[in-house]
Interface confidence: low
């Protein structure tokens, strides 16, 4: 399924090259996008063509901070937006319950070492339902062709992934069991130890459990013990696949 999303996303990527001395990286963004009022949209950026280490990604709307994904501290959503903004997928951001006021420029700001800062721009237009439908009519033939191609590719990928997973299932099951026993017994991921990428830390001093895809939906926020200045996280972000 993730492969499908990646393929679909790749169709709309726009290159945003940076002309800045030694900085070789490129931010790819979803470019100009439109969505229907009341709906939701995924904002995506991807940093490529650099070996720089990503330490943090900021999402901003004009001058307002929406969210941050920090390599060590995980996700943080601005209190003003926490009801309508969800972290992910990946390092992207999902905006929900869109209003016309959400129309505007959005920026993904990648903090990297040693390159410095890379910025990508996305323009979002939130349309009234009728306008969105009207605009969609002109895109249907092209989208249909793209969708058909993608369905074929996706189906193939799903079949391959499913078969691979089936083979691995028994092995993974036993590994997970070992992990659970280990963490419950030894508290290897104690409150003062970092949680592994893609996981989040449960409340109080309990060892961290493995959680849903970088989202921490099933997990409590990081307990205050973890951070006594206002870095409240929703689980770690993994930057390992971000550059290339």
């Amino acid at each position: 399924m993730r492969w499908c999303l990646l393929l679909i996303w790749a169709q709309g990527l726009r290159q945003a090259p940076l002309a800045s001395g030694m900085m070789t990286g490129t931010i790819e963004t979803t470019g100009n996008i439109s969505a229907e009022k009341g709906g939701s949209i995924i904002l995506q950026c991807h940093l490529s063509s650099t070996t720089a280490q990503v330490t943090q990604v900021n999402w901003e709307q004009q001058d307002q901070l929406l969210a941050i994904c920090n390599a060590d501290l995980g996700w943080h959503i601005s209190p003003s937006f926490k009801d309508r903004v969800a972290p992910g997928p990946g390092l992207g951001l999902t905006l929900q319950s869109l209003t016309v006021n959400d129309t505007g420029e959005y920026f993904c700001i990648y903090h990297t070492y040693p390159d410095g800062t890379y910025t990508g721009r996305i323009f979002l237009e939130v349309l009234e339902s009728s306008v969105a439908e009207h605009g969609a009519r002109f895109q249907i033939p092209l989208l249909g062709a793209m969708a058909a191609t993608l369905v074929v590719i996706c189906t193939a990928v799903i079949v391959v992934v499913a078969l691979t997973r089936k083979k691995k299932a028994l092995r993974i099951h036993s590994v997970e069991g070992d992990l659970r026993r280990k963490s419950a017994g030894q508290e290897e991921w104690s409150p003062s130890a970092p949680s592994p990428p893609g996981s989040c830390v449960q409340a109080e001093a309990a060892p961290a459990g493995l959680c849903g895809e970088q989202r921490g939906e099933d997990c409590a926020e990081l307990h205050d013990y973890f951070n006594v200045l206002s870095y409240r996280s929703l689980g770690n972000c993994s930057f390992f696949t971000e550059t290339g």
Epitope: N58, L65, D72, H76, Y225, N227
Partner: antibody, heavy 118, light 107 residues
């Protein structure tokens, strides 16, 4: 422009009281966790107290050395944070800084000098 | 309380020189560490947080690193405005605690 305007400090007798205030401008004060930090030649920089957000029911935390004597409070409508200091002793002498923190944003005010002496 | 041991307590260096200040945490702090700069007039500014993330507007000559329980702040090429006091701050658990500071002086 971000500003954290301090109140006047001053000289107070041992056992006395003093209230410090800090007025913020240039940022969304209500989103920020606010702290008081003090500095003295003897102890260096020392965190004193913290107050969180409305959504956290304005939860407060204090350093052990000031618990029961100091009270931190805030008024979001006035973008202000306060530190009420009672039963002051010589060990409370120092420069008091107000500090605002919201994820990657971090602001410090100018220090206010407090001297406890008879 | 978590003890933060900062070294050296003072350091003399020349313009253009590369300097490294270190901080050792007495307990695991998992990268929850920031570096602060205090100018002679008392103004405090955070330079780095999460051990290595540079604050907005801070020159790239500043960088932070973590190696186990040792944390370092490196200034790659000193400029005149860098001569100040530097402190590390852990915020992994209450109470947040500071290092004793490093006074960086011009040679």
């Amino acid at each position: 422009e971000v500003k954290l305007e301090k109140s006047r400090g001053g000289l107070v007798k041992p056992g006395g009281s003093m209230k410090l205030s800090c007025v913020a401008s240039g940022f969304t004060f209500s989103n920020f966790w606010m702290n008081w930090v003090r500095q003295s030649p003897e102890k260096g920089l020392e965190w004193v107290a913290q107050i969180r957000l409305n959504s956290d029911n304005y939860a407060t935390h204090y350093a052990e050395s000031v618990k029961g004597r100091f009270t931190i409070s805030r008024d979001d409508s006035k973008s202000s944070v306060y530190l009420q200091m009672n039963s002051l002793g010589a060990e409370d002498t120092g420069i008091y800084y107000c500090h605002g923190n919201f994820y990657d944003l971090d602001y410090w005010g100018q220090g206010t000098s407090v001297t406890v002496s008879s | 309380d978590i003890q933060m041991t900062q070294s050296p307590s003072s350091l003399s260096a020349s313009l253009g020189e590369r300097v490294t200040l270190t901080c050792r945490a007495g307990q695991e702090i998992s990268g929850f560490l920031s570096w602060l700069q205090q100018k002679p007039d008392g103004t405090i500014k955070r330079l780095i947080y999460a051990a290595s993330t540079l604050d907005s507007g801070v020159p790239k000559r500043f960088s932070g690193r973590r190696s186990g329980s040792d944390y370092s702040l490196t200034i790659s090429s000193l400029e005149s405005e860098d001569f100040a006091d530097y402190y590390c701050l852990q915020y992994a658990s209450y109470p947040p605690t500071f290092g004793g500071g490093t006074k960086l002086e011009i040679k």
